[in-house]
């Protein structure tokens, strides 16, 4: 009971309500104020969570009732507030006060194993007392309320192998188990509350206990004897056969390795198939029937992983005997060497022996051999394997020959072997040196004595060696040529010097200088070479760079005055040609009379990113000439606008999009105003030809002989790209750029 300090306050019993009451309403207690002496009219009010729903108060008496079944496990405590009001005044007699309704526990919940399903793994053969797993049950009842939540564990199924500790739920092993006999066990555990007393509630759970494998079994061969055969031609790594051992263990504990006990392990090996654990006997080294026709092998098997404590179970490894029979094969010939390198000097006569190759039959019958040679017609081979030349060899033509020699057995031509033969041709000094290039040599008319005219060098087709050396000499026979002298630089070059001051182009325009070049080969070879020196009018600069252009005309005997006259004539002819071209175009006449055969011109298109050969595909001129569009005469004032409109039409070849048109027109404007644009007379053509040019065709293709008198002044309006056309066809057209 509670009263506040000034002797005013609430009076009530300690409020407890049992859970799970089945009555419609259950009286919990009565709220009373000690001011309520029976003469007053006091009204009691209940406030807070649960008031008016779970708990109802008789406001006249203060009696509190629970009108719902309560579950302590859902809610064990209700905190409510109470008020007392004097009916006469309508005012609260006391301050609002808080009180508690506690829900008392009954044993209405059975133990539950919340962590189900339980599964545990324990090694087989584990000793007694080994901990397997701990199971734990939960009871929702109040652990502080008697024994409602005090549990005891017991084993309903699983004896005699397992036991459970009553208070902890720890499951332990009670006797050793062999996985190879049974690999899993179902154990049923019961948990009882009320420490097992009468009226207790219980719950059960199942525990799956799996035995994990330990390596307590050794592998044993299925068979004690195996017989295999192998061909002597079998390559290394060939599978001869399979052997098999069984192990009652699983996983890593069943992994095994096979081995060969004796010396035959050099010839045979056993590898394991990891999927099947079979031993695959393979050939480690080639066998030869002629050498040994059968082998006896003793193989043994053991586990890969054995713990020390389990080693006693693995003593005396299982063994098996394998007999391998070698089968005879007709083997191909065998060359003594895998390949041959032979050498021969160049220039030897045909029939010269280069060298000999040899192959033998490895079989017992020792068949004779027949040889064939491929790779060059310069060599042949006889039945002894001797290779001879069939032509004289020139190192400067080919320094190496790659030949293939094939040997076949006479008794069985199907048995073939090949070997590579490399023939190196040695160099001999059989090529004289010569000028390394053609020299176009000039000397100025005003050259001075001692002036360098030409530096010459030589080459030799023979094999270049480090101490290769050339010697240069002025021929003694060249007595009439004392105008020049030769100096050997001793570095495989020589210098030609002027031996006099001044030359006369008119009197002696050309000099021929005979030069001897010798090499240092054994024997030494010498060649005679002629150097042509042309006299040139270099002017004051004494620079011979311009001489190459003048040379031809001067050599032909033309004088300076004649050359100038010829050039003027050429220019006049060109001017006349262009005048005729312009007049013909203005009258829309063909420049050339029409022939029976049309021209086919390659039109180069530059309107793509590059199409390789497609850029230069010839158009069918017939198609161009049979155009359905007639180029009708238009009024001159409209032609400029028409060209622009035709240009716009040509833009519509691609997608008809205002965005594309705007973009291309911007690019056109950009190109027209670009100071770095290409020369205006460069040809720019497009795949779409339009619907005809108001200017008419400028080519010989499909020209019409109408519109004789056209005015081309409108070309000036088309921008800088049409400047060249405007200047060619316009009448007194002024460039406007």
């Amino acid at each position: 009971d509670y009263k506040d300090d000034d002797d005013k306050g609430w009076v009530w019993n300690q409020f407890f309500v049992p859970e799970e009451m089945n009555t419609t309403s259950h009286h919990i207690g009565q709220l009373r104020s000690d001011l309520d002496n029976g003469n007053n009219s006091f009204q009691y009010k209940l406030l807070g969570a649960g008031a008016g729903s779970t708990f109802i108060i008789d406001e006249r008496t203060g009696d509190i009732y629970a009108i719902q079944k309560l579950d302590r496990e859902e809610r064990s405590l209700y905190i409510l507030r109470a008020q007392v009001i004097d009916i006469a005044t309508g005012r609260a007699v006391e301050p609002e006060s808080e009180f508690v309704i506690k829900v008392s526990d009954i044993n209405d919940n059975e133990p539950k194993f919340l962590d189900e399903p339980y599964e545990a793994i324990v090694p087989e053969m584990s000793p007694e007392g080994t901990l397997v797993i701990q199971v734990t049950a939960s009871d929702a009842d109040d652990p502080s309320s008697g024994n409602n939540a005090r549990l005891l564990y017991s084993l309903l199924q699983g004896q005699p192998y397992f036991s459970v500790e009553p208070t902890t739920g720890v499951i332990r092993i009670s006797s050793k188990m062999d996985r190879e006999l049974q690999d899993e066990y179902w154990v049923i555990i019961q948990a009882k509350d009320m420490i097992g007393q009468p009226g207790a509630l219980s719950g059960t759970t199942s525990v799956l206990i799996k035995l994990s494998d330990v390596n307590d079994n050794k592998p044993i061969f299925k068979e004690s004897f195996y017989r295999f055969t192998i061909s002597e031609s079998a390559p290394i790594g060939t599978s001869i056969g399979k052997i098999m051992a069984y192990d009652d263990d699983i996983g890593e504990n069943a992994e095994m390795e096979y081995s060969i006990e004796d010396d035959d392990s050099k010839i045979f090996d056993i590898i394991i198939d990891n999927d099947t654990q079979e031993g695959i006997v393979i050939l480690k080294k080639k066998v030869d029937f002629e050498q040994q026709s059968y082998y006896g092998i003793r193989a043994k098997v053991k586990n890969c992983h054995v713990d020390e404590e389990l080693a006693p179970a693995h003593v005396n490894a299982s063994t098996t005997y394998i007999k391998v029979q070698v089968e005879d094969e007709d083997e191909p010939p065998v060359f003594l060497l895998p390949y041959y390198i032979l050498e021969i000097p160049e220039g030897k006569p045909y029939g010269t022996i280069v060298g000999t190759v040899s192959a033998t039959d490895p079989d017992r019958r020792q068949s004779p051999m027949r040889y064939y040679l491929t790779g060059s017609k310069m060599f042949d081979i006889n039945d002894n394997g001797t290779i001879i030349t069939t032509n004289m060899l020139d190192r400067e033509v080919s320094a190496w020959y790659n030949l293939t020699v094939t040997a076949t057995e006479t008794y069985n031509v199907q048995q073939i072997s090949s070997a590579h033969v490399y023939v190196q041709v040695f160099n001999i000094n059989d090529n004289a040196p010569e000028f390394s290039q053609f020299y176009e040599t000039y000397v100025c008319e005003n050259a001075e004595s001692g002036e360098i005219v030409q530096i010459i060098s030589a080459i030799d087709r023979d094999e270049s060696i480090e101490d290769h050396h050339f010697y240069f000499n002025h021929s003694l026979e060249d007595t009439n040529n004392s105008s020049f002298m030769l100096t050997d630089n001793q570095d495989n070059t020589a210098v030609i010097l002027s031996n006099r001051t001044g030359f006369n182009l008119k009197e002696e325009p050309v000099f021929y200088m005979i030069i001897l070049i010798a090499d240092n080969g054994i024997p030494s070879l010498t060649s005679t070479n002629t150097l042509t020196i042309q006299v040139c009018d270099c002017g004051d600069s004494r620079n011979t760079e311009t001489c190459a252009n003048k040379g031809l005309l001067f050599i032909m005997g033309f004088r300076t005055e004649a050359i100038i006259a010829i050039m003027i004539c050429v220019m006049v002819i060109f001017g006349f040609f262009f005048l005729i071209l312009a007049l013909k175009q203005r009258r829309k006449e063909t420049l050339f009379p029409e022939k029976t055969e049309d021209f086919r011109e390659n039109i180069f298109c530059y309107d793509d990113e590059g199409g390789g050969e497609e850029d230069s595909e010839a158009f069918d001129i017939v198609e161009l000439r049979q155009s359905t569009v007639m180029r009708e005469r238009k009024p001159q004032r409209s032609k400029s606008a028409e060209i622009r409109s035709l240009y716009r039409q040509s833009l519509q070849v691609g997608p008809d999009s205002a965005i594309f048109r705007k973009f291309i027109l911007e690019k056109l404007e950009e190109a027209n105003t670009d100071p770095c644009a290409p020369p205006f007379d460069s040809l720019q053509t497009f795949a779409y030809e339009g619907t005809g040019s108001s200017a008419g065709s400028l080519s010989s293709l499909a020209s019409r002989d109408t519109d004789q008198e056209d005015d081309f002044d409108y070309l000036n309006d088309l921008g800088p790209r049409f400047k060249r056309l405007a200047s060619m066809f316009g009448s007194a057209v002024q460039p406007n750029n």
């Epitope: 419609t24 309403s25 009286h27 009219s41 009204q43 009010k45 109802i56 008789d58 406001e59 006249r60 008496t61 009696d63 009732y65 009108i67 009916i87 006469a88 309508g90």
Partner: antibody
Amino acid sequence: QVQLQESGPGLVKPSETLSLTCTVSGGSINSYYWSWIRQPPGKGLEWIGYIYYIGSTNYNPSLKSRVTISVDTSKNQFSLKLSSVTAADTALYYCARESRYRSGWYDAFDIWGQGTMVTVSS
Amino acid sequence: DIVLTQSPGTLSLSPGERATLSCRASQSVAGSYLAWYQQKPGQAPRLLIYGASSRATGIPDRFSGSGSGTDFTLTISRLEPEDFAVYYCQQYGKSPITFGQGTRLEMK
């Protein structure tokens, strides 16, 4: 609409227990206070006591020692037991419902049964 | 207990007349928790007025109640033939609930 009907023996012997039942129809017994009132022949009305639907009771002190009022919400009924009856307990017994004009406190009786006459006689 | 005394014991009036019934409490009735009932022979009482002055549902407005503390009055402004019956006052401001002895209203 809510109607009340009293039922029970019309004749009770002295010193025995008078038992009456009031059946509520047309509405729920929940959330109301239910009273028993009696009227001796030719006399005024006397309040016997009430029961709240939750089971809370309050009796007239003059009869408290002999009166028990109970409720069965599942049957929508409430009952009166008056023990040790005498001839003075002969009366017309009414069951009535308090209105809810004033929540929580006592209120006037807005619905009455037709009454059942109980005679205490040997 | 609060004792209610009604007066007069019997009141003889004619239809159309005004009737005034009095109820006096032995002590103040808390919150004016006083009601008036009408009972006709062979019938259960019928609630007329609650809270001293509030008309119950379906009661004609010729019935009115007044008063507080210890003195309360029921007034029938214009008597109708069906109004002739016994009238009881009841207090419910304090337990136990008590009734007056009644006033018989008869036709003159």
